[in-house]
């Protein structure tokens, strides 16, 4: 994992996350529910697992939320299609390292990406989609916590 | 207006180095990733890597890799691309390109920059 | 790297005429790819994005399809301001590859 650093701005994301995250939230329908909230599975994911579910979840955002989430706010859509730009440029640097066989998908890891997306699935899409979007920081707050993220001068 | 600036024709001898710049104006510098890409004459293009102007944070494509470097001055919203130990085959016309930024994201190299012709000539 | 090959590399249309650019990509690239537009001496121009997304401000007649490894540009009814090399560009994976380029002439 080591030689597997996501060279991004974590900083820059959270920054602009933290702008728009009270406007976002405050659009979640389904307060009581959760999507990555309280998953107790991401807590427990083994340095081993890492890798793979940071690209399965990166995969998760990319190919699902930011597809079908639907802004009308040009202010925060702008500041969301700049957090997802930044999600496509760490998905990429995953797949090298997974090009270099240093990103193997084990059956925990697995399992953990499966129990988001079914979480997902149980709510209409764009309620779902917002609700994902509002827990962004549970996320970002994970990949802190679990890479070593190289912040380039 | 939104513009990328490069800087003019270099001229240089084989094994020296040249660095292009490339200004941005008529948008935030620090929103947007920027690509190099160069073109041989009467060649196709080449890719030859990015840089994160927000954090400084670059990919280079393995063929230049310990040869290039890329920088930016955010102070003066500027990327720089600067190429070493050049050789006859790098002459080139090479270009700084910005990457979009959409929903759902994507890439693509939506502004371009006029261009830069670097000819490495003993 | 992955390779990309475009075909033909050259051909010759008529104004009117409907145009289509093959790009075959050595492995499987998803929707990771697009089209560009380059007249001498010019930079290029970005057409088609994400394989089929059409580019703010370029013409409808101009359009993309395909995933994986075949993808096609088409242009529906060639104009006189269409006749220039196009680009296909893969990045799916590093480093991102352009095909050859197919130059697309006067008949």
């Known amino acids: 994992l080591r030689r597997c650093l996501i060279s991004t701005d974590m900083h820059h994301i959270e920054e602009s996350f933290q702008e728009i995250k009270r406007a976002i939230q405050a659009k979640d329908t389904f307060p009581n529910v959760t999507i990555l909230s309280t998953l107790e599975t991401l807590q427990i994911i083994k340095p081993l697992d890492v890798c793979c579910v940071t690209k399965n979840l990166l995969a998760f955002y990319v190919d699902r939320v930011f597809k079908d989430h639907q802004e009308p706010n040009p202010k925060i859509l702008r500041k969301i299609s700049s957090i997802a730009n930044s999600f496509l440029y760490m998905q990429k640097t995953l797949r090298q390292c997974q090009e270099q066989r240093q990103c193997h998908c084990r059956q925990e890891a697995t399992n953990a990406t499966r129990v988001i997306h079914d979480n997902y699935d149980q709510l209409e899409v764009h309620a779902a989609a917002i609700k994902s979007l509002g827990e962004l920081d549970v996320f970002l707050a994970w990949i802190n916590k679990n890479h070593e993220v190289m912040f380039s001068a | 207006q939104v513009q990328l600036v490069q800087s003019g024709a270099e001229v240089k001898k084989p094994g020296a180095s040249v660095k292009v710049s490339c200004k941005a104006s008529?948008?935030?510098?620090?929103?947007?990733?920027l690509h190099w890409v160069r073109q041989a004459p009467g060649q196709g293009l080449e890719w030859m890597g990015w840089?994160?102007?927000?954090?400084?944070?670059?990919n280079y494509a393995q063929k230049f890799q310990g040869r290039v470097t890329m920088t930016r001055d955010t102070s003066i919203s500027t990327a720089y691309m600067e190429l070493s130990r050049l050789r006859s085959d790098d002459t080139a016309v090479y270009y700084c390109?910005?990457?979009?930024?959409?929903?759902?994201?994507?890439?693509?190299?939506?502004?371009w920059g006029q261009g830069t012709l670097v000819t490495v000539s003993s | 790297a992955i390779q990309l090959t475009q075909s033909p590399s050259s051909l010759s249309a008529s104004v009117g005429d409907r145009v289509t650019i093959t790009c075959r990509a050595s492995q499987d690239i998803r929707s990771d790819f697009g089209w560009y537009q380059q007249k001498p001496g010019k930079a290029p121009k970005l057409l088609i994005y994400?394989?089929?997304s059409l580019q703010s401000g370029v013409p409808s007649r101009f359009s993309g399809s395909g995933s994986g490894t075949d993808f096609t540009l088409t242009i529906s009814s060639l104009q006189p301001e269409d006749f220039a090399t196009y680009y296909c560009l893969q990045d799916y994976n590093y480093p991102w590859t352009f095909g050859q380029g197919t130059k697309v002439e006067i008949k």
């Open positions: 008529g948008y935030t510098f620090t929103g947007y990733y």
């Open positions: 840089i994160n102007p927000n954090s400084g944070g670059t």
């Open positions: 390109a910005r990457d979009i930024v959409v929903l759902p994201p994507a890439i693509g190299f939506d502004l």
């Open positions: 994400a394989a089929s």
